[in-house]
């Protein structure tokens, strides 16, 4: 039994980090295999995870951490059995995915602008908390080249359109994704996409 | 070189005090954590204290809790042991130790407790 | 708390054995375990780390070995300099804990 890709780990820097592998063949990831972690710091505890099938060679495991800090790096060793597959080192704050943010909200009834808010995915006291950026990406569901992202640059997690710049009278969805500048993190995954019936009223024309 | 040197072991009655210290060199003191391991006259060791390099960490085994306090001055590169209600199972070898994480790296000569009537 | 047993509290040996030292750990300890070394008269010297990693001045005639709960120090060629008393300790959980200790004595 051999790793054929080593394992890559990303943290939310909260309470989670994933890590991925793949074995040089089929395995049973969780009777076959154990990823051991420990926080390189005084008298800290050893950890055991038991990983999960992702594909037929493919194991992923959930580390649960306390809250992590810049500084936090942990040796990771993967066994089979008494046999030593890998040892290597992850320091969370290098390898941020932040978490998704939730309750993506399309409120429809202020005058004729979309209010889309959503929740921070992060306590006041985790550090990310007041450095997500975000990617709102809204379609329609009947013309696949409406397709838009707009950039969320500051703090707040809402953005206000004029309904005007969508077509009237049909469906659309969006979604909504995080990053964060200062730790250089990869996108998070998109919220779950909510719908709405676009409609409001054209202005009147006068000739 | 590295260098601890402990001192304040002597004989004590059950139930007194004793405040053990160690003077630490050749090293930045206050990069390191550093801990008391004991050895009883039968030859076992016991880890007593630890202390992270800035003082804010300190742990205590159950066994140890109540009657130990471990603290440090990094301006004087001291580390040191207050014991109270001492027993005559505290009659040890006491080391200060350097430990950067999970292992004691570098132990000083020891000072002797002696807890007897 | 982890209980660290090191069954043979004493070793008569000659200069040139090859000597073996056990330790049992009550839990599986995944290579988390370091040996020291305490000459008579002197304090404990961390020897290895990581169940087989030697320390910086450690004569190779050592080595470190073994997995699970059952490990191993191994000295290829005993030298009168190596009578000593040999210490396990896991740092698998807190609180680390010891070995009792195996001591070798000269025959």
């Known amino acids: 039994m051999k790793v054929l890709q080593e394992p890559t780990c990303v943290s939310d820097y909260m309470s989670i980090s994933t890590c991925e592998w793949k074995m040089n063949g089929p395995t049973n990831c969780s009777t076959e295999l154990r990823l051991l972690y420990q926080l390189v710091f005084l008298l800290s505890e050893a950890h055991t995870c038991i990983p999960e099938n992702n594909g037929g060679a493919g194991c992923v495991c959930h580390l649960l951490m306390d809250d992590v800090v810049s500084a936090d790096n942990y040796t990771l060793d993967l066994w089979a059995g008494q046999q030593l597959l890998w040892k290597g080192s992850f320091k969370p704050s290098e390898h941020v995915k932040p978490r998704a943010p939730g309750n993506l909200t399309v409120h429809t009834n202020v005058s004729d602008t979309l209010l889309l808010t959503w929740s921070n995915p992060y306590p006041p006291d985790n550090y990310l908390y007041n450095h997500l950026t975000y990617a709102v990406n809204i379609w329609s569901e009947n013309d696949p080249a409406d397709f838009r992202i707009y950039n969320v640059t500051y703090l707040e997690p809402s953005l206000r359109i004029a309904a005007s710049t969508l077509k009237s009278g049909i469906s659309y969805r969006a979604r909504v994704r995080a990053w964060a500048q200062c730790y250089n993190t990869t996108w998070s995954e998109w919220s779950p996409s909510t719908k709405w019936h676009n409609s409001y009223r054209e202005p009147f024309e006068q000739h | 070189e590295v260098k601890l040197v402990e001192s304040g072991g002597a004989l004590v009655q059950p139930g007194g005090s004793l405040k053990l210290s160690c003077a630490a060199s050749?090293?930045?003191?206050?990069?390191?954590?550093m801990s008391w391991v004991r050895q009883t006259p039968d030859k076992r060791l016991e880890l007593v204290a630890v202390?992270?390099?800035?003082?804010?960490?300190?742990y205590y085994p159950d066994s140890m809790k109540g009657r130990f306090t471990i603290s440090r001055d990094n301006a004087k590169s001291s580390l040191y042991l207050q014991m109270s209600s001492l027993q005559s199972e505290d009659t040890a070898m006491y080391y200060c130790?350097?430990?950067?994480?999970?292992?004691?790296?570098?132990w000083g000569a020891g000072t002797t407790v002696t807890v007897s009537s | 708390d982890i209980q660290m047993t090191q069954s043979s509290s004493s070793f008569s040996v000659s200069l040139g054995d090859r000597v073996t030292i056990t330790c049992k750990a009550s839990?599986?300890?995944?290579?988390?375990l370091a040996w020291y070394q305490q000459k008579p008269g002197n304090a404990p010297r961390l020897f290895i780390s990581?169940?087989?990693t030697l320390e910086t001045g450690v004569p190779s005639r050592f080595s470190g070995s073994g997995s699970g709960k059952d490990y191993t120090l191994s000295i290829t060629s005993l030298q009168t300099e190596d009578v000593a008393t040999y210490y396990c300790?896991?740092?698998?959980?807190?609180?680390?804990?010891f070995g009792g200790g195996t001591k070798l004595e000269l025959k």
């Open positions: 130790t350097l430990i950067t994480t999970w292992y004691f790296d570098v």
């Open positions: 050749g090293f930045t003191f206050n990069s390191y954590g």
């Open positions: 202390i992270s390099s800035d003082g804010a960490y300190t």
């Open positions: 839990e599986e300890l995944y290579n988390r």
């Open positions: 990581g169940a087989t």
């Open positions: 300790q896991q740092y698998w959980s807190s609180p680390y804990t």
